[in-house]
Every structure is written in structure tokens, then in C-alpha cells.
Amino acid sequence: DVERTTCPPEKEVHEIDESLIFYKKRELEACVDAALLAAQMDRVDAIPFTYEQLDVLKHKLDELYPQGYPESVIRHLGHLFLKMSPEDIRKWNVTSLETLKALLKVSKGHEMSAQVATLIDRVVVGRGQLDKDTVDTLTAFCPGCLCSLSPERLSSVPPSVIGAVRPQDLDTCGPRQLDVLYPKARLAFQNMSGSEYFVKIRPFLGGAPTEDVKALSQQNVSMDLATFMKLRREAVLPLTVAEVQKLLGPHVEGLKVEEQHSPVRDWILKQRQDDLDTLGLGLQGGIPNGYLILDLSVREALS
């Protein structure tokens, strides 16, 4: 912490300007009034403060706003944002997309994924839902940031907004996030024709249930292996060999090269070997002919 000293009269600060770069840390602490700093935050980013000096300025703001900074200050943080921790950001209430854009630009090229995720979370809370303007801002200024939101936050996305989401925006989404987004996408694209629907729904399919995957297998979609590998394991396991063959079309030969990877490996183990042999790919590891499959989970449920 910066030690307290009194400010020499000749060093008194009446406005935030470039002369402050020559102040030592303890002089900044003693001479800069926090309320003045907050009122003139828009000037701070134009001044080449050292990181040590920025620490002092942050300390000033923290003392003035222990419950969290107001948006008028947040909007003009500039490079001071790089000093913020997720705990600091969690106290904020942000509603302006201009504020979000400004801080996303500052964070670019810095290791700030936790801070950015928290900031986006605060914006969604502040605005009440993940609306189209927010999604547009995220896709433009922070591709992939959509997936930093929790499934709970993503549940506030109206289906009408889903069309603004691009495939690359979903690249880092996990299964729980896709579970939330998939039903919304399905609703958003429901009036599209078969091939157009598949192109649109493809990035969201990691959240699709078995029955939807089975339905796709009847539509000659020729799903590529990259998409197949992103399907939920639970959605793939009940598919028959014939359904997978129809689903993948000409891409079915790719099962061979991915046979060691889940969910392909797990799916192979659940198929009869003679069914797998009909594919002519040399897939091994299926249930040998003549073996009975007892589903013990069903027996346990009955007892």
C-alpha cells in the first residue's frame, strides 16, 4: 500500500494532465484528489502513466468507490482496465455497449480472459438479457467471448438473436452451453428448408438430443466428421449403423481414422460387429456375433 504523506503546496493538482507523469508514487497518492480523478477520467488514457502510477490511480478510485465504480468512470478506464481483477469488475453495473466496446479494445492482446468474461457477465446482468445489440458487439469485438458466459446467462438469449451468432463464435462453447443454445437455434431456424437448416444448425449440434440427430439422418445432410465428433456422446450411442451411414453419407469412411476417438470409439463398442462389417471400413471392436446384450440399468430400475 502507498504510504500517506501530505502534498507539497507546489505539487497540488487542479487538473489531470501530463505533468503528473513526473510525480512519484507517494506524490500522486498525496496530491491527486480521487473525486477530481473520477471527474476527469476521460483524460487519463491519453497520459503515458507507468504501471506503478496506474496502481496509485486505481487505489484512489477503489477508496472513492468501495462498492464498485460508476459507469461514467468505467467507460473511460482505458489502460487502467488492465489493472482490474475479476473481483473488482464483479462490483460494476454496466449497461452501455460503448463501455463494453472500449474495454474489449483495451484488453485485446492481453491475457485478460477472466476479466473479459466477468465484464461481459456484468453487461448481460445490467441490460437484463443477452439482446441482439450485445451479441453483435461481442461477435464484432470479441469472437469466442459468447462462450465465456455461463449457461444461466446464455438462457437469456431470445431465439430471434441466434441468427446473429456465427460458427466461430461457438468454437469455445462447452456442452452445457450448447445444451442451452441448441433448442433456441432449433426454434430460430425451424422454418428453413432441409439443406439451409443444416448449414445454420450445424454449429449448435453439440447440444442436440438423439431424436434430432436421428431425424437429420433421414435428410441426406452428409454431416462431416468434425460435426459428428462434436455431438454429445449420449446422442451418438443409440444411433444404429444404418443411421450413422445415412447421416454421414460419403463422409462415413472418416469413421475409420477416428475410430480411436470418442464418441466414435464408444459407438463402435455398442454396435454388432456384423453390422459394422457392412460399412466395409474394417472397424473393429463391435459386439461379436451370437452375443446377447443385457442392459443391467433397466433391471436395476425395475428392482
Epitope: Q168, A226, G254, K256, V257, S262, G282
Partner: antibody, heavy 119, light 108 residues
Framework: EVQLQQSGPELVKPGASVKIPCKAS????????MDWVKQSHGKSLEWIGD????????IYNQKFNGKATLTEDKSASTVYMEFRSLTSDDTAVYYC????????????WGTGTTVTVSS | QIVLTQSPALMSASPGEKVTLTCSAS???????LSWYQQKPGSSPKLLIY???NLASGVPARFSGSGSGTSYSLTISSMEAEDAASYFC?????????FGGGTKLEIK
């Protein structure tokens, strides 16, 4: 332009570990597996294993089981290979190579990282 | 595992000459699952041919590939100086995926 950028040469002591990054750019990171290949001096190529960046799933050549560990960071579009308990036999150039999921050929190769194990 | 044996290990050819490199597998390889790579000294390997006979993007038409079962070949219809390199065949028909020992091709 599709690129796979690897780090510079590494000089490591026997018994130590090395972690080599492979940063991908210019394509959808999760549509391609990342495979790793070893090339000992003036010799042929040996497949080490691969990782599916979408699921984090890995498979290894049995020869490198316990020796190599592949991990990924989707947010940074980077795959890492850690090589443990290094011996002089591990002195080689290590390449990452992109493989479209469902195909077995490597259409783009990394720049290669030379690892020299010496005391 | 499938062992791929390339022959010859070293060969030299004159400009304009037709060159054939062979790759023999210890057991049958599905032809969709065989590819060829070219590697020049100090550089990374480069995909030349995939699925036995398909030319990779940007590869000159003088290169061609053929074969099935356990016998595969790479042909250069008319040798050029820039073709001096090492060539490796590669199979992913059977786990673990393997490479041939390579053929070093020099220009006379």
C-alpha cells in the same frame, strides 16, 4: 493464410521435460485434429499421437504412451505437447500437423521444434 | 503395426527423366488411406498426394500416385531440379499410423 507456429529450439537436460506449443491461425481450430510427428536426425517420421481440439480427446501411438501428453487451449487456438523423462533418444525435430477430422492426411505442417537432450 | 518399406532408399535422376518411387506395406492398406509427403532439407514435410492418387493443392501435375493393397507408387513424369527432396509414404488404414523410411531423390 493457414499457419501452425511452433516455438524455437530447446536444449534440455536428461530426465527433464519439455512443453512445445503449436499456435494455429487462419482456420476453424475445432474442425481439425492436431497430430504430432517426431523426426530424428536424418531419419524417417514417427507418428506420436493426436488431439481433437473440440473435445480435448487424445490418442497416442503406444510407443509414446506415458512419454507424451497432448493438451489444448481453445481460447488461444494452441495445442501443446509435453515430453517427459527425456533421454538422448528423444533428440529430434517435433512437428505439429493439421489433419481434417475424418481424414488421415496432414495438409499443413508446423515449423518444427528442435529438441536437443544433452547434459 | 503396418510397416511401410520404401525403395530405393536413395536415387538420382536427370532433368526430364521419369521417376518412380515405391512403397510396400507389410499388410493390406485401404487405398483411401495412403498419402505421400515431400520434404526438402531444413523444411517441414509438405503434403503431395492423398488417398493414393489425389494431388494436393498447388502440386504440379507431373506428380501422380497409384496402387492398391500392399503396393503403392509415386511417379514424377519429368524430373525437375526442384523435385530433389526426400519422399515419405504414410498410411492411416491401421492403428498406429505409420510412415515409410523415405526415399531421397537427388538431381544428376
Amino acid at each position: 493464410e493457414v499457419q501452425l507456429q511452433q516455438s524455437g529450439p530447446e536444449l534440455v537436460k536428461p530426465g527433464a521435460s519439455v512443453k512445445i506449443p503449436c499456435k494455429a491461425s487462419g482456420y476453424t481450430f475445432t474442425d481439425y485434429n492436431m497430430d504430432w510427428v517426431k523426426q530424428s536426425h536424418g531419419k524417417s517420421l514417427e507418428w506420436i499421437g493426436d488431439i481433437n481440439p473440440s473435445t480435448g480427446g487424445t490418442i497416442y501411438n503406444q510407443k509414446f504412451n506415458g512419454k507424451a501428453t497432448l493438451t489444448e487451449d481453445k481460447s488461444a487456438s494452441t495445442v501443446y505437447m509435453e515430453f517427459r523423462s527425456l533421454t538422448s533418444d528423444d533428440t529430434a525435430v517435433y512437428y505439429c500437423a493439421r489433419r481434417r477430422i475424418g481424414t488421415g492426411y496432414f495438409d499443413v505442417w508446423g515449423t518444427g521444434t528442435t529438441v536437443t537432450v544433452s547434459s | 503395426q503396418i510397416v511401410l518399406t520404401q525403395s530405393p532408399a536413395l536415387m538420382s535422376a536427370s532433368p526430364g527423366e521419369k521417376v518412380t518411387l515405391t512403397c510396400s506395406a507389410s499388410s493390406s492398406v485401404i487405398s483411401s488411406y495412403l498419402s505421400w509427403y515431400q520434404q526438402k532439407p531444413g523444411s517441414s514435410p509438405k503434403l503431395l498426394i492423398y488417398r493414393t492418387s489425389n494431388l494436393a493443392s498447388g502440386v504440379p501435375a507431373r506428380f501422380s500416385g497409384s496402387g492398391s493393397g500392399t503396393s503403392y507408387s509415386l511417379t514424377i513424369s519429368s524430373m525437375e531440379a526442384e523435385d530433389a527432396a526426400s519422399y515419405f509414404c504414410h498410411q492411416w488404414s491401421s492403428f498406429p499410423y505409420t510412415f515409410g523410411g523415405g526415399t531421397k531423390l537427388e538431381i544428376k
